[in-house]
Amino acid sequence: QKKGAPHDLKCVTNNLQVWNCSWKAPSGTGRGTDYEVCIENRSRSCYQLEKTSIKIPALSHGDYEITINSLHDFGSSTSKFTLNEQNVSLIPDTPEILNLSADFSTSTLYLKWNDRGSVFPHRSNVIWEIKVLRKESMELVKLVTHNTTLNGKDTLHHWSWASDMPLECAIHFVEIRCYIDNLHFSGLEEWSDWSPVKNISWIPDSQTKVFPQDKVILVGSDITFCCVSQEKVLSALIGHTNCPLIHLDGENVAIKIRNISVSASSGTNVVFTTEDNIFGTVIFAGYPPDTPQQLNCETHDLKEIICSWNPGRVTALVGPRATSYTLVESFSGKYVRLKRAEAPTNESYQLLFQMLPNQEIYNFTLNAHNPLGRSQSTILVNITEKVYPHTPTSFKVKDINSTAVKLSWHLPGNFAKINFLCEIEIKKSNSVQEQRNVTIKGVENSSYLVALDKLNPYTLYTFRIRCSTETFWKWSKWSNKKQHLTTEASPSKGPDTWREWSSDGKNLIIYWKPLPINEANGKILSYNVSCSSDEETQSLSEIPDPQHKAEIRLDKNDYIISVVAKNSVGSSPPSKIASMEIPNDDLKIEQVVGMGKGILLTWHYDPNMTCDYVIKWCNSSRSEPCLMDWRKVPSNSTETVIESDEFRPGIRYNFFLYGCRNQGYQLLRSMIGYIEELAPIVAPNFTVEDTSADSILVKWEDIPVEELRGFLRGYLFYFGKGERDTSKMRVLESGRSDIKVKNITDISQKTLRIADLQGKTSYHLVLRAYTDGGVGPEKSMYVVTKENS
């Protein structure tokens, strides 16, 4: 290219279809210059024009020779250029923002623009750069890229951005530019120019000065507040704490709060102060609703479903900001709502949902919602399996007979399609409680009835009931307790009877024991005693309770004594006992010792004893007839333990074992014994019968039984030299080697001769008795032997 010829050819395109090529004019050329532009590849095309640019259709791949001939007043000049697509720049047209709007309540900017894709034939990726600037000084606050695709037609694009600062606080500007990325274009791709700027600003109203107003925010977030004011703002506080001011345009200021703490229920106050005023707002920092926990749906009555849940973590938001709950049933599309004005701390919430006809399975979703978010829990229930019955009411007990009653109660609800399992608690006084389960068909009218048998007559019972469905979910609460006394029945057994002959042998004394309550079946009013022989039956007059003994004058013939107990309903079966005893010649008196509280008696099995055994006992020292108490044991027994509160240690008792056959009793064993042996309480009385120069004969008496306090096992006789009323040691004091002791174990022995003594010497003699319970006290005596002759 010659100097003074066209130079600096540059080609750009905005759509890849047309290239706009321009060059610089040769120096010194004026307005009246014409140009001839020829483009040559395989063919040649020439264009005549009067300006330094030309629009040509985009050239296909390869090199093209461009010749530009300039024709002017003082001659012509020619330049040649080689043009290839790689030398061409793709610069999109300057975009234009169609619309910039704002939602001040959420501090969000909304941007809308057209990509003008209709002028661009090829599918291409576009990168948009969006710039947000704040304040009159246009500080950059956001630069973001946004990707779209050109697809041959004009497309509207939208972009939104939530500002960290309320939009009311300062003017916000937005501008955009773009960059087209085309895979098929080998030239240079460049950014478009920035669009004309658009802005959003707040038209202040007279009221609101601080932004945002009454904002709900997540605990831990950062938030910016500002004060739009014509007055100079002097300070800002959150709660009672000052915050540094950030100066905006004019007198407007902002504060930035980081990691905000949870608010009190009344919110957190944010205030800005001026010389004469305070402007403020309230912020509510809390949490979105936690997932409802332990969601449980059940029914009391198959009419209404109660869904309850625990709200979980406290949101710290109350009143209009509190969590609202909606319970949606998906099969029916029905829902119920709960709006809490106050959020309690951690208590259970509940909603009631009316059951739908012919629907048993419910799919519930519990939606929780507050200004910070939502959460949900779901539960699928077959409601017939989730029945928690009401507490049974109107619980009543009525007699059927002496061993059966009718229980009735009220259980509200329509249970026609299900069965109940009810648990009846039966409690007798001073007895373990019994539980009985009954299955009953559910009814529509809420009234239930059940019969309860196998009870005892004339027994005070306490009943209560609770119910669950057969497909167990929960027991109802227990009903109120009901006390009921069953009616009387005839006594089921005759009294436990015994007989003794009077001490003169002329009268038979009949004894019987009161019937236990479970055999009396009512209040015993009287007893009938009769005696019968082969010839006759003699009845005594009726004996009123509480007398438990009768006396009949009888000869020594054999009679059967019969005792019958009577209550208001009837008589017991008779208890029979023979008056005569079956003789037993070969009886020895045995000794028995107990175990502190009772005494164990054993015997050999005797097949002849067909009715029972009787053990009778009495205090040995008491006069006849000897009867303190008796006990009957079955005929297959071979042992029993006799215990009585009246037994005392150291007291001798007589025990008699009788066997029974055909109502007649035979004395099988006679025993004397102690529940517990003690040491004797007295020493034996003893005397010196004879003395010589070398011996002494001592004689002693029996200790009375009452004072022995156990079976006598022997005597301890101590003797040694010693004088009365001297300081010499007494016989029983320890450390004396010259004391001799004799243990006399033959308890029939009543004398003792002590030999090999010294003459004319004083001896100290001591005698003690002992039982297995211990050694008794001592009795002592001083004796002087005779002089040797």
Epitope: S235, L237, H240, T273, N277, I278
Partner: antibody, heavy 116, light 107 residues
């Protein structure tokens, strides 16, 4: 926990000076405006002076303006009240209190007696 | 300056009583009012701010209401610990000003 401890009170003659101090602990001292409030024996509360959290602004009650100066040293967590030209009517318990607008914590006070 | 007037100056009451104290401002102070409790020989203690906001740790039997120039402090059921003096304070503008106080004493 928040603690404010006043010191420097005592008996002083009219016309003399006294400097009260208030040592703060248990909170970020530099984030709170601070006040002096006084209470004459048997009387109600009277606000005396306030200083901004950063010390940039100070306000005084008309009764002490020109005689008293409030100041703070955030590096030492301490508030001061310089009292000059004391008068008999300045006799009171002087409390230092936290909070530019609302006083949420108070010290136990220090007694200043102005008497000849 | 904004003047604050409290009434009554003394109030006799019994445990369990509902007690109301009134505070009037000489000009509108919006809701910029605080209440303090002071026991003999002790420093004041903040009860309420912004007329009705309960300070943390203060029992819920205390409540505040009002805006503009008329304000009340209510104790729903007076407890033995509540016998003390009560002061209102405006903080709309400097100088901060206190009411003259109300002494609540045992009847």
């Amino acid at each position: 926990q928040v603690q404010l401890v006043e010191s420097g009170g005592g008996v002083v003659q009219p016309g003399r000076s006294l400097r009260l101090s208030c040592a703060a602990s248990g909170f970020t001292f530099s984030s709170y405006g601070m006040n002096w409030v006084r209470q004459a024996p048997g009387k109600g509360l009277e606000w005396v002076a306030v200083i901004w959290f950063d010390g940039s602004i100070k306000y005084y009650a008309d009764s002490v303006k020109g005689r008293f100066t409030i100041s703070r040293d955030n590096s030492k967590n301490t508030l001061y009240l310089q009292m000059n030209s004391l008068r008999a009517e300045d006799t009171a318990i002087y409390y230092c209190a936290r909070g530019q607008l609302v006083q949420d914590f108070w010290g136990r006070g220090t007694l200043v007696t102005v008497s000849s | 300056d904004i003047q604050m007037t409290q009434s009554p100056s003394t109030l006799s009451a019994s445990v369990g009583d509902r007690v109301t104290i009134t505070c009037r401002a000489s000009q509108s102070i919006s809701s910029w009012l605080a209440w303090y409790q002071q026991k003999p020989g002790k420093a004041p203690n903040l009860l309420m701010y912004k007329a009705s906001n309960l300070e943390s740790g203060v029992p819920s039997r205390f409540s505040g209401s009002g805006s503009g120039t008329e304000f009340t402090l209510t104790i729903t059921s007076l407890q033995p610990d509540d016998f003390a003096s009560y002061y209102c304070q405006q903080y709309k503008s400097n100088p901060l000003t206190f009411g003259g106080g109300t002494k609540v004493e045992i009847k």
